[in-house]
């Protein structure tokens, strides 16, 4: 049975999944999906990496923590109640059969008080993204807006603008995790 | 126009060997997972393999993974199933088959299929 | 491993009938399922997957629908190119596994 993780709607949800790379830098395949995982990969992918970097995400999924370090702990950006359901984790370790499966349950609770509207910066107009697509027609990498100016100290302001920190040191500890080579 | 052509299948003995080879042509090889499904004679589908992008990862049906083995060359575009030790049991037409894939999905469905090679294990 | 169980394995039917075949996995696969297509000599051909969504080229008189343990795939009306052998086939659990099969053949 899925391991069950709770957010409230408007906040930022924090489903971990975790394992340590055979060496640093030495990195794993991941993909997160919506939807218990299937045989091979996952299904409704909202998120992959590869063996170097995050080569796919869709709008509000993105990766929190040190991915390089094996934290590919999936964040969630101000959730609905339409995002509860099962989540895949699926860390694609290489040789037979070797993948490591976790479904994780998303529940999503209504917010206990409305908060006072405040003013909130736009996570994917400030990172467009560039999805390198599979087996997706001719066009396989498709630009969507090109990267603004930004520095380091403003995308450091901005991760911990939408980090929901208090949840995910709460459930940091009760994530799955795996240990390679 | 993808197409997908298996050959290498024939007459063998108990406990002989033979290797497949399934030729694609007409899509980007390296960015789908590829499968091997059999059917014996007047019977039904049985999956046999699975190789992931790379061939980094392989999946088998459990009874076949001592015997058989899955690879593939993505500079040439050949999927190969290896198979050792064959029994009268895996007499069977042997398809070769793409995983479905666009980028939200996954390969667990496929949705093309080789013509099938014929294998016939008899002494 | 999930068994995958095809009800009926055979069946008579007119041009024009609508027809349904059922499917049954032995445990929940979700909306994991996939339904294919094949005629005498002929590799399978997909039809159906997650399902209930329709490939790319398949006629609309084709539908799949169910989830969890029940799945059907229904031809509102039954044309002379329809009569082949249906397989189900789930892609939850290891290893996939494949319905045996339902003949459908002109009355």
């Known amino acids: 049975s899925e391991v069950e993780y709770r957010a409230e709607v408007g906040q930022n949800a924090y489903l971990p999944c975790f394992y340590t790379p055979a060496a640093p830098g030495n990195l794993v395949p991941v993909c997160w999906g919506k939807g218990a995982c299937p045989v091979f990969e996952c299904g409704n992918v909202v998120l992959r990496t590869d063996e170097r970097d995050v080569n796919y995400w869709t709008s509000r999924y993105w990766l929190n923590g040190d991915f390089r370090k094996g934290d590919v702990s999936l964040t969630i950006e101000n959730v609905t109640l339409a995002d509860s359901g099962i989540y895949c984790c699926r860390i694609q370790i290489p040789g037979i059969m070797n993948d490591e499966k976790f479904n994780l349950k998303l529940v999503i609770k209504p917010a206990k008080v409305t908060p006072a509207p405040t003013r909130q910066r736009d996570f994917t107009a400030a990172f467009p993204r560039m999805l390198t697509t599979r087996g997706h027609g001719p066009a396989e990498t498709q630009t969507l807006g090109s990267l603004p100016d930004i520095n380091l100290t403003q995308i450091s302001t901005l991760a911990n603008e939408l980090r929901d920190s208090r949840l995910a040191n709460d459930l940091r500890d009760s994530g799955a995790t795996i240990r390679i080579g | 126009e993808v197409q997908l052509v298996e050959s290498g299948g024939g007459l063998v003995k108990p406990g002989g060997s033979l290797r497949l080879s399934c030729a694609a042509s007409g899509f980007t090889f390296s960015d789908y997972y590829m499968t091997w499904v059999r059917q014996a004679p007047g019977k039904g589908l049985e999956w046999v393999a699975s190789?992931?992008?790379?061939?980094?990862?392989?999946y088998y049906l459990d009874s076949l993974k001592s015997r058989f083995t899955i690879s593939r060359d993505n500079a040439k575009n050949i999927l190969y199933l290896q198979m050792n030790s064959l029994r009268a049991e895996d007499t069977a037409v042997y398809y070769c088959a793409r995983g479905y894939y666009y980028y939200g999905s996954s390969p667990n469905y496929f949705d093309y299929w080789g013509q099938g090679t014929l294998v016939t294990v008899s002494s | 491993d999930i068994q995958m169980t095809q009800s009926p394995s055979s069946l008579s039917a007119s041009v024009g009938d609508r027809v349904t075949i059922t499917c049954r996995a032995s445990e929940n696969i979700y909306s994991y399922l996939t339904w294919y297509q094949q005629k005498p000599g002929k590799s399978p051909k997909l039809l159906v997957y997650?399902?209930?969504t329709l490939a790319e080229g398949v006629p609309s008189r084709f539908s799949g629908s169910g989830s969890g343990t029940q799945f059907s795939l229904t031809i509102s009306s039954l044309q002379p190119e329809d009569f082949a052998n249906y397989y189900c086939?789930?892609?939850?659990?290891?290893?996939?596994?494949f319905g045996q099969g339902t003949k459908l053949e002109i009355k």
């Open positions: 190789i992931n992008y790379d061939g980094r990862n392989t």
């Open positions: 086939q789930q892609h939850y659990g290891t290893p996939l596994t």
């Open positions: 997650n399902a209930k």
